[in-house]
């Protein structure tokens, strides 16, 4: 029994004066608490508690269920205890069958003994099944058997407390261990779509999926830079023991422009937090924005190919697309496709493939697109570069030599004189007159240039060359002269193609 210094309050004393008492079932339990300031006896076993205000606790016929801790407390709050075992061969265990364990923590299988002198107090699997090899325990006859560091793999483990009595194994009622998983990673969060584009009045609905090992994961939808509580609906499922899924759906039944912004789905557990965002853009009406992928003024050589390419944003989806040239609509030679297969894609590509362009096929090519709200168009001005062609080369009545050439870009005409029979004409002759004529063809067609020189300047036999050239190529025409006496004769002009 405790001893204290005189003058200090002391704990009560209990008779019999031992920490543990063993009585047989049916025998009397008589416990006396001696203290001038006696308050009460308390009895505890498992979750049961009883009190007695008499200083002597008497149980006339002890039963196994009277096994437990008897505590006497005085008015100073000081106490003393004795543990009583009521030995009953027919009831070796007191049990509380609820058994929950938190992963990585210890949990108590509550099967205290009524007889501390039995041996091999341990755990056994149900129906002879083996226990996990890594399961470890600490026995305490007064409390039960502590399973150390519960593993997730022990979930739904069926077990018994076991003792040996007279050479035979005796099992308690069965326990089923339910393991509450520990959070060892942040929740996994995903969102149904990363961005939403809506017109005013349309419904905005977005779903966040939260996955974790248990339902005690916390989640919420938040609007960035706002404290307003959002309305969400939940659905949840357990896919097996440690695979929990929750779907949190946020809905705005009639979205307004000022609902635009970033919405965050946030989830956390004891390990940490995770979030994912989605962007809402609400527009008052639909739109189409066109972006040319090449310059809208295009130069292409005669006989070559060119692709006219546009990208465009369209919301709602485009309904009609067409390419037009000279008031005619192309039925083929073009393709239109979405920029990505993403469900929220609003970007599209349209390509017009022009092949082996002729000089006559320059002009304005227009792409038109429309949706339910707007129309939009873009024009490409296509110029076909052509090698000069000499249209006419004549000696006029006034003695002038005239050369008319057409091509694109605008040709330049140079004149050369070749004396005698020389093949190379190097002496250049300055023209008297140069004019750019209006072509009778469509705009973007060939440009016509007329150049004249005075033939009276030539005093010797020879050849005059009219050379028309531009970036694409050159062409020449020749005038041959022969003198008979004082008479100058023009021999028929001829052209030579010079690549």
């Amino acid at each position: 029994q405790p001893s204290v210094s005189p003058g200090e309050p002391s704990p009560p004393s209990i008779h019999p004066g031992k920490s543990d008492l063993i009585v047989r079932v049916g025998d009397e339990i008589r416990l006396l608490c001696t203290d001038p300031g006696f308050v009460k006896w308390t009895f505890e076993i498992l979750d049961e508690t009883n009190e007695n205000k008499q200083n002597e606790w008497i149980t006339e016929k002890a039963e196994a269920t009277n096994t437990g801790k008897y505590t006497c407390t005085n008015k100073h709050g000081l106490s003393n205890s004795i543990y009583v075992f009521v030995r009953d061969p027919a009831k070796l265990f007191l049990v509380d069958r609820s058994l929950y364990g938190k992963e990585d923590n210890d949990t108590l299988v509550r099967c205290p003994l009524t007889d501390p002198e039995v041996t091999n107090y341990s755990l056994k699997g149900c129906q002879g099944k083996p226990l996990p090899k890594d399961l470890r325990f600490i026995p305490d006859p007064k409390a039960g058997i502590m399973i150390k560091s519960v593993k997730r793999a022990y979930h739904r483990l069926c077990l018994h407390c076991s003792v040996d009595q007279e050479g035979k194994s005796v099992l308690s009622e069965k326990f089923i261990l339910k393991v509450r998983p520990a959070f060892k990673a942040v929740p996994v969060v995903s969102v149904s779509k990363a961005s939403y584009l809506l017109r005013e009045g349309e419904e905005f609905t977005v779903t966040c999926t939260i996955k974790d090992v248990s339902s005690s994961v916390y989640s919420t939808w938040k609007r960035e830079n706002s404290q307003t509580k959002l309305q969400e609906k939940y659905n949840s499922w357990h896919h097996g023991d440690f695979n929990y899924e929750r779907q949190a759906t946020l809905t705005i039944s009639s979205a307004r422009v000022n609902d635009s912004g970033v919405f965050m789905c946030y989830a956390n557990n004891t390990f940490g937090s995770a979030n994912v965002t989605t962007t809402l853009e609400v527009v008052d009406k639909g739109f189409i924005n066109i972006f040319p992928m090449i310059n809208t003024t295009v130069f292409v050589n005669d006989g070559e190919n060119v692709d006219l390419i546009v990208e465009y944003e369209a919301f709602p989806k485009p309904e009609h697309q067409q390419w037009i040239y000279m008031n005619r609509t192309f039925t083929d030679k073009w393709e239109d496709y979405p920029k990505s297969e993403n469900e929220s894609n609003i970007r599209y590509v349209s390509e017009l493939h022009l092949t082996r362009l002729k000089g006559t096929e320059g002009g304005t090519y227009t792409f038109l697109v429309s949706n339910s709200d707007v129309n939009a168009a873009i024009a490409f001005n296509v110029y076909v570069n052509t090698k000069p062609e000499i249209l006419t080369y004549d000696r006029l009545v006034n003695g002038m030599l005239q050369c008319v050439a057409a091509g694109f870009p605008e040709p330049t005409i140079d004149w050369y004189f070749c004396p005698g029979t020389e093949q190379r004409c190097s002496a250049s002759v300055l023209p008297v007159d140069v004019q750019t004529l209006n072509s009778s063809g469509p705009p973007f067609g060939k440009l016509v240039v007329q150049s004249s020189i005075d033939s009276s300047a030539f005093k010797h036999n020879g050849t005059v060359e009219c050379k028309a050239y531009n970036d694409v190529g050159k062409t020449s025409a020749y005038f041959n002269f022969a003198f008979k006496g004082n008479n100058k004769e023009q021999i028929h002009p001829h052209t030579l193609f010079t690549p």
């Epitope: 341990s122 996990p132 090899k133 399961l135 470890r136 600490i138 305490d140 006859p141």
Partner: nanobody, 125 residues
């Protein structure tokens, strides 16, 4: 870590008694499970007895029950094995083992972490 030292082994006649001691030092307060195993030449290590340091629960195989008794002295940090009615087949090296807790299969020597060097018990006929 815990260090274990066995003593008390020796030569004894059949029918005689011996008391083995296992003294523990180091971080012994964290080690609740104490056990005795024995190994005869050419045989597997065999479970003899075990005791819970905190709760005083005892463990025996049926073959040893009655002749062998395990006990403890907390003040001396020592576990004892009282062996009575010894037989020649009890001849073996007796080892003391310890761990923080009991394995579910407390008779499986592979599941204990700490071991003494052993003490030889010879029972002559």
């Amino acid at each position: 870590e815990v260090q274990l030292v066995e003593s008390g082994g020796g030569l004894v006649r059949a029918g005689g008694s011996l008391r083995l001691s296992c003294a523990a030092s180091g971080r012994t307060f964290t080690y609740d499970a104490r056990a005795w195993f024995r190994q005869a030449p050419g045989k597997e290590r065999e479970f003899v007895a075990a005791i819970s340091w905190s709760g005083g629960s005892t463990y025996y195989p049926n073959s040893m029950k009655g002749r062998f008794t395990i006990s403890r002295d907390n003040a001396k940090n020592t576990v004892y094995l009282q062996m009575n009615s010894l037989k020649p087949e009890d001849t073996a090296v007796y080892y003391c083992a310890a761990d923080e807790s009991f394995p579910a299969y407390y008779s499986d020597y592979a599941l204990y972490r700490y071991w003494g060097q052993g003490t030889l018990v010879t029972v002559s006929s």
